[in-house]
Amino acid sequence: EAYKSEIAHRYNDLGEEHFRGLVLVAFSQYLQQCPFEDHVKLAKEVTEFAKACAAEESGANCDKSLHTLFGDKLCTVASLRDKYGDMADCCEKQEPDRNECFLAHKDDNPGFPPLVAPEPDALCAAFQDNEQLFLGKYLYEIARRHPYFYAPELLYYAQQYKGVFAECCQAADKAACLGPKIEALREKVLLSSAKERFKCASLQKFGDRAFKAWSVARLSQRFPKADFAEISKVVTDLTKVHKECCHGDLLECADDRADLAKYMCENQDSISTKLKECCDKPVLEKSQCLAEVERDELPGDLPSLAADFVEDKEVCKNYQEAKDVFLGTFLYEYARRHPEYSVSLLLRLAKEYEATLEKCCATDDPPTCYAKVLDEFKPLVDEPQNLVKTNCELFEKLGEYGFQNALLVRYTKKAPQVSTPTLVEVSRKLGKVGTKCCKKPESERMSCAEDFLSVVLNRLCVLHEKTPVSERVTKCCSESLVNRRPCFSGLEVDETYVPKEFNAETFTFHADLCTLPEAEKQVKKQTALVELLKHKPKATDEQLKTVMGDFGAFVEKCCAAENKEGCFSEEGPKLVAAAQAALV
């Protein structure tokens, strides 16, 4: 159906509250440096305009595209040149180039300080004083720090945030109530951000086909009773939704996501037996619930894969007539039978199967050539299984912090050119895989670990792309989406690296370290560890363990001293000298 006014159409579909929230998110993701008040004003103006168009679709400018309307609005910002430099040049372009230009200027690492919550009474006062403004500030702060955050999901988290405050601001001990709830939400939000960034990178760097393959595998595992046409329908719609959100088309994205949730609920009989509870919820919760829904049980009568994909005498004919359909059904059938495999592994198996058919269907005797294809998958399956087993054992032995340090050493040696903050951030996140996945049952470990690692390594790739410094990182990031993790796992020590000059300033510590929260204290120590390795890349694990132990003792001693700063300035240089001697 063609609408006279696209903006009126979206306003009517989404309703005023969601419309305004999404516009605020969109502007905050594009203009990450602007103050909150400016964005509130812009969002208010756009919402008022949309409201007017909904009342009178043939009003002035109501027929303009959303990109034109949003771009024009962004280009009215007076401080564009001062705050954003060459982003202001985007305003000289015409659509669609102007929007592409804005997208290209999104900054994945804007460097804002971490959000620090004021004390609970002040927070509750702000919440009760103006709920809408309070939640708007939340949307703004998350959106500007995470310019690819999945917008409809951010609206859901804002609703959760509201629920936390509505409950905890009534509690006797507000701090005790808010603390753990806000922290749990924060963890979910950070994971959600990283997952969507991975989806956007898949689409932008590797195209629709890569994203669709990933989604076919994931949804076939989750909905093994659905037929291939049903999975394909949901995947096609889901691809459109994520393409829109990754492209900054947040109103269309949220609207289409709601339509997809409606479709899934209307057709749950042919999708999954697990959707009933989700489908009774309001739209934001419904979509979120569907995205997180537990796996359905496998149908009981699934025949062996070999019958259709190895033993059938028409394998090559079927493959050659419709390659994508044939490989799609292979991926679907394999995934629904193997919920315990990671999506990345399933995609590697499909790739291997495709390569085998390409080779074998060109021979005189294809059936003999591909007869053992399913057996040849074994090494591909063993590799992530062994990796997870080994690393979970290491995690059990060392705990999260120790495991992070082991990964820091590993990754600094692989790519010592990468900036220290990036190595620390990525290794800390990689280390969290232990906490997140190693306690799960064997049947869920690989899927949990490898797919989480893919998301974290994507963060490394995104940060590295901004300032490329390592050819091997570039190679692992760009050659193949599904082989990124094995590529990084396979990197050995970079022998070409020239050690960094020693800089005493890097290893100078002050008394302010003592008052930092535990996590930030760890970051300081881990930063020192990376710098140490960049200075002495040949250091052995034993040497590093000794030096880090000494460093921990030094921090503990000085933080317990009466004259903390004096202790740091006196003992610090001694520690550095001892460390240098130990690492000769």
């Epitope: 037929d227 046409a229 049903e230 042919s270 059938d312 079927n318 359909v325 679907y332």
Partner: nanobody, 125 residues
């Protein structure tokens, strides 16, 4: 029991268009797919495309992708195959077929339970 009735077909110049239709009667189930296959003289039956009755999702063979389009009219229990930019190598007898969507091997003639009588399409150069 499902009966399939075909119409359309005939002779057309290369580059021209034709529309085939396939109407189903009898007991028609949900979770069905309707496939189109073709058979040229002396050749095996070849997959052309398939449409899901429930949601309208389509899949095509590599040789017709971008030229042929399938659609369905639910009320009339009919599927259509719109064939554009026809080539001499598209000459064949075209069959429609109905099968259960659950098997997923939509490209395989052996997976379809019911077949139409076929209709000749000839593309002259």
């Amino acid at each position: 029991q499902v009966q399939l009735q075909q119409s359309g077909g005939g002779l057309v110049q290369a580059g021209g268009s034709l529309r085939l239709s396939c109407a189903a009667s009898g007991r028609f189930f949900s979770r069905q797919v309707m496939g189109w296959f073709r058979q040229a003289p002396g050749k095996d039956r070849e997959f052309v495309g398939v449409i899901s009755w429930d949601n309208g999702v389509t899949f095509y063979s590599d040789s017709v992708k971008g030229r042929f389009t399938m659609s369905r009219e639910i009320a009339k229990k009919t599927v259509h195959l719109q064939m554009n930019s026809l080539k001499p190598e598209d000459t064949a007898v075209y069959y429609c077929a109905a099968g259960n969507a659950l098997h997923s091997r939509y490209y395989s003639p052996s997976k379809y339970d019911y077949w139409g009588p076929g209709t000749q399409v000839t593309v002259s150069s």
